[in-house]
């Protein structure tokens, strides 16, 4: 899997989990989430060689088309795969509100 | 949604689904399928700037992000989001067989 | 060049099962038809089935039905034969071979072959 | 499943002798389902005719094949001595796949 464990240990051009810091305030003006000040989103980055952690049949067959075909510009793409959630603190006036976001961290990556 | 109803009748450079048209003998160098010789794949391309059509709250998070840290290599990709099968025709020695292969056809895009 | 390269001998004891594998390299695996024949003294050659890459599409001679599993890793380039249930019978030379292009066909390049013997 | 049956089972020829080794098909194949192989002791089986009658890249010319329906034939023009080894023909016509029981030819 293309998670942390593979992905931090190994430097890897191909596609892969990359570390990303995001600060709420700073990166994304959002001055509203009171804890925690940022986290850990990751993200997907890297080239998507033949068969190279394809998702799908469409991807694996994208893959065998741009090996054939080297000068086509149709090629799978490094997206995320498994996401979780984040729990944040904010504050509605004075009362503390806990809320779970969606979706907010890449934990694995494949080519799609 | 950005399918070919909206994608073949625009110009557009964001993320959108593309036509590709795939010969198997040519363009794959599968010999065994006999019907069809080919068939639209297609592909997903172009950009993702913010929020066009984001997928998750990861990618609209990145999107954000990528707004705000032009520099950042962090950024959504595009990619498929519905697929269809294709029905095929082989042979095994002179017995005709019909096969339903799963997720072959690209229908529409989204930016994750 | 277009190379196979299998698994080495193995010995199985009876009801036991084996899986081989078949390293493609030199060509495009996933263009190709993978088959998978046996050989021994006594029956000569024997057809067990083919497996195509990319779409999984597996087919199988109707005797080994039901015990024999044919796979396709695309991303190692590698097939495997995994045989169930064996027999003192099924002791024989494997060889994991790429057809022409279709899915019954003729075979053009073959594995080294993996000797697997059957035996209490 | 079809029977491949391979005549004679054993040959000794001569260098530069023309040999001639049959393939009968229990049922008709038509005209392209047929194979021919070559292997020698403790080695792979080679290919060298596919199709009745199309040579594997690589193979000498003194091999040919020919034949349609249930009769298929593999002739060796002018024999060599590398030529010593065990011929198998092979239907692909019909699952499953199967060969003919060999012929092995000795070089005199």
């Known amino acids: 899997a293309l998670d942390a464990a593979y992905c931090f240990r190994n430097v890897q051009d191909n596609c892969c989990l990359r570390p990303l810091y995001i600060d709420f305030k700073r990166d994304l003006g959002w001055k509203w989430i009171h804890e925690p000040k940022g986290y850990n989103a990751n993200f997907c980055a890297g080239a998507c060689p033949y068969l190279w952690s394809s998702d799908t049949q469409h991807s694996r067959v994208l893959s065998l088309y741009n090996t054939i075909n080297p000068e086509a510009s149709a090629s799978p793409c490094c997206v995320s795969q498994d996401l979780e959630p984040l729990t944040i603190l904010y504050y509605i006036g004075k009362t503390p509100k806990i809320e779970q976001l969606s979706n907010m961290i890449v934990k694995s990556c494949k080519c799609s | 949604a950005l399918d070919a109803a909206y994608c073949f009748r625009n110009v557009q450079d964001n993320c959108c689904l593309r036509p590709l048209y795939i010969d198997f003998k040519r363009d794959l160098g599968w010999k065994w399928i006999h019907e069809p010789k080919g068939y639209n794949a297609n592909f997903c391309a172009g950009a993702c700037p913010y929020l066009w059509s984001s997928d998750t709250q990861h990618s609209r998070v990145l999107s954000l992000y990528n707004t705000i840290n032009p520099e950042a290599s962090a950024s959504p990709c595009c990619v498929s989001q519905d697929l269809e099968p294709l029905t095929i025709l082989y042979y095994i020695g002179k017995t005709p067989k019909i096969e339903q292969l799963s997720n072959m056809i690209v229908k529409s895009c989204k930016c994750s | 060049q277009v190379l196979l390269v299998q698994s080495g001998a193995d010995v199985r004891k009876p009801g036991a099962s084996v899986k081989i594998f078949c390293k493609a390299s030199g060509y495009t695996f996933t263009s190709n038809v993978i088959s998978w024949v046996r050989q021994t003294p006594a029956q000569g050659f024997e057809w067990m089935g083919g497996v195509i890459p990319i779409v999984d599409i597996a087919n199988y001679a109707q005797r080994f039905k039901g015990r024999l599993v044919l796979t396709a890793d695309t991303s190692t380039n590698t097939a495997y034969m995994e045989l169930r249930s064996l027999k003192s019978a099924d002791t024989a030379v494997y060889y994991c071979?790429?057809?022409?292009?279709?899915?019954?066909?003729?075979?053009?390049?073959w594995g080294q072959g993996s000797l697997v013997t059957v035996s209490s | 499943e079809i029977q491949m049956t391979q005549s004679p089972s054993s040959l000794s020829a001569s260098p530069g002798d023309r040999v001639t080794i049959t393939c009968r098909a229990s049922q008709s194949l038509g005209s392209s389902y047929l194979a021919w192989y070559q292997q020698k002791p403790g080695k792979v089986p080679k290919l060298l005719i596919y199709?009745?009658?199309s040579r594997a890249p690589g193979v000498p010319s003194r091999f040919s094949g020919s034949g349609s329906g249930t009769d298929f034939t593999l002739t060796i023009s002018s024999l060599e001595p590398e030529d010593a080894a065990t011929y198998y023909c092979q239907q692909y016509a019909d699952s499953p796949i199967t060969f003919g029981q060999g012929t092995k030819l000795e070089i005199k």
């Open positions: 199709g009745a009658s």
């Open positions: 071979a790429s057809t022409l292009g279709l899915v019954l066909d003729a075979m053009d390049y």
